[in-house]
């Protein structure tokens, strides 16, 4: 897979492949994988990709199911890159506060908060 | 501060306090704090709260600015709790795939993806 494929297109393709191979993937009825109990997905990327690793090791490879796992690996690479960018730029307090305000604003409006 | 305050109310109050104390917080003109370079805030909670810690250590405490940092500490506690819930429940592959599909769907529609 060319890594030049835009991440947004990669995600779309992966969703389609996930749907295509669902029957094959759920064939192992005894396998149990940790599933987050909330919908703030970004907090759980580590566990999600650990789960994908478990699933891959239990799935017969070949054909486009390999492409699915390759895609998921590229998505992980993208997210790892984003995580690296969390502390890259050292900025004035002013800018940190603007980012913090935006973070809390998003938390206020978009997060699924269970108290 | 009673920890029983709903997290959503806590976030709202913290936004207000952040605005109130902005001038005091930015008084240190030479301080530099890492600022994430993207808007996928949930990926960067660790760095954000490290930054808050740096800011707190450089800010003269007293009055409601203390309440601001206490609130932020409670928000961190909430997020840490959410992170613990990422791997708590072991579920069938079927259920993991549902979560994965939802994660990719959210990534597809809501994440800010720069390729």
């Amino acid at each position: 897979i060319p890594t030049e494929i835009p991440t947004s297109a990669l995600v779309k393709e992966t969703l389609a492949l996930l749907s295509t191979h669902r029957t094959l993937l759920i064939a192992n009825e005894t396998l149990r994988i940790p599933v987050p109990v909330h919908k703030n997905h970004q907090l759980c990327t580590e566990e999600i990709f650990q789960g994908i690793g478990t699933l891959e090791s239990q799935t017969v490879q070949g054909g486009t199911v390999e492409r699915l796992f390759k895609n998921l690996s590229l998505i992980k690479k993208y997210i790892d890159g984003q995580k690296k960018k969390c502390g890259e730029e050292r900025r004035r307090v002013n800018q940190f506060l603007d980012y913090l305000q935006e973070f809390l604003g998003v938390m206020n409006t978009e997060w699924i908060i269970e108290s | 501060i009673p920890t029983e305050i709903p997290t959503s109310a806590l976030v709202k109050e913290t936004l207000a306090l952040l605005s109130t104390h902005r001038t005091l917080l930015i008084a240190n003109e030479t301080l530099r704090i890492p600022v994430p370079v993207h808007k996928n805030h949930q990926l960067c909670t660790e760095e954000i709260f490290q930054g808050i810690g740096t800011l707190e250590s450089q800010t003269v405490q007293g009055g409601t600015v203390e309440r601001l940092f206490k609130n932020l500490s409670l928000i961190k506690k909430y997020i840490d709790g959410q992170k613990k819930k990422c791997g708590e429940e072991r579920r069938r592959v079927n259920q993991f795939l549902d979560y994965l599909q939802e994660f990719l769907g959210v990534m597809n529609t809501e994440w800010i993806i720069e390729s």
Epitope: R91, Q95 | T30, V35, H38, E114
Partner: antibody, heavy 117, light 109 residues
Framework: QVQLQESGPGLVKPSQTLSLTCTVS??????????WSWIRQHPGKGLEWIGY???????YYNPSLKSRVTISVDTSKNQFSLKLSSVTAADTAVYYC?????????WGQGTLVTVSS | SYVLTQPPSVSVAPGQTARITCGGN??????VYWYQQKPGQAPVLVVH???DRPSGIPERFSGSNSGNTATLTISRVEVGDEADYSC???????????FGGGTKLTVLG
């Protein structure tokens, strides 16, 4: 390498609104590490900061221009814009857009705007 | 609001040292940035955070800042250094950017 390019009319009539757009290439305007700023320079004079905007929409304006200035951002086009209302001949200047981290990192080449009837 | 004062002009012979000052109330507590601007071009950062040079800027350019004065020093001045030089700080009480009025450096030929 981030590049910025100003565009807009070079001539504006007095009392009208000056509108300029800055297109960012080689980087994303959604980069939370930067503010996006406008600066102007009257002929033969020093630099004058007009204002800046954060990706979230937070804006900061020069107090002397605040009542007439609006800066906005369009992340889908990777652009940000300046509007300066009720212009007079005193607004004739070279207008620069720039990215602003801890300092002004990248600048456009500047565009001369003349206010004249 | 915060004000920065620069001399309108400084003249120096090639090979000599030029010093351009930037005055402001307690400027030593702020970080100062210096920009070089040649005719018809956009400004270029030559010193940031009082005394740090961006990559590509010759070692001849240096800065200092204390008390009420920041100084940009250009040693072994060359003809190509002739330009306008502006200082800049942040006014933290308002989150505003402040520029000095600029200093024209003339290299005497």
């Amino acid at each position: 390498q981030v590049q910025l390019q100003e565009s807009g009319p070079g001539l504006v009539k007095p009392s009208q609104t000056l509108s300029l757009t800055c297109t960012v290439s080689g980087g994303s305007i959604s980069n939370a590490g930067y503010y996006w700023s406008w600066i102007r320079q009257h002929p033969g004079k020093g630099l004058e900061w007009i204002g800046y905007i954060y990706y979230s929409g937070s804006t900061y304006y020069n107090p002397s221009l605040k009542s007439r200035v609006t800066i906005s951002v369009d992340t889908s086009k990777n652009q940000f814009s300046l509007k300066l209302s009720s212009v007079t001949a005193a607004d004739t200047a070279v207008y620069y857009c720039a990215s602003l981290g801890n300092w002004f990192d990248y600048w456009g080449q500047g565009t001369l705007v003349t206010v004249s009837s | 609001s915060y004000v920065l004062t620069q001399p309108p002009s400084v003249s120096v012979a090639p090979g000599q040292t030029a010093r351009i000052t930037c005055g402001g109330n307690n400027i030593g507590s702020k970080n100062v940035y210096w920009y070089q601007q040649k005719p018809g071009q956009a400004p270029v950062l030559v010193v940031h955070d009082d005394s740090d040079r961006p990559s590509g800027i010759p070692e001849r350019f240096s800065g200092s800042n204390s008390g009420n004065t920041a100084t940009l020093t250009i040693s072994r001045v060359e003809v190509g250094d002739e330009a306008d030089y502006s200082c800049q700080v942040w006014d933290s009480s308002s989150d505003h950017v402040v520029f000095g009025g600029g200093t024209k450096l003339t290299v005497l030929g």
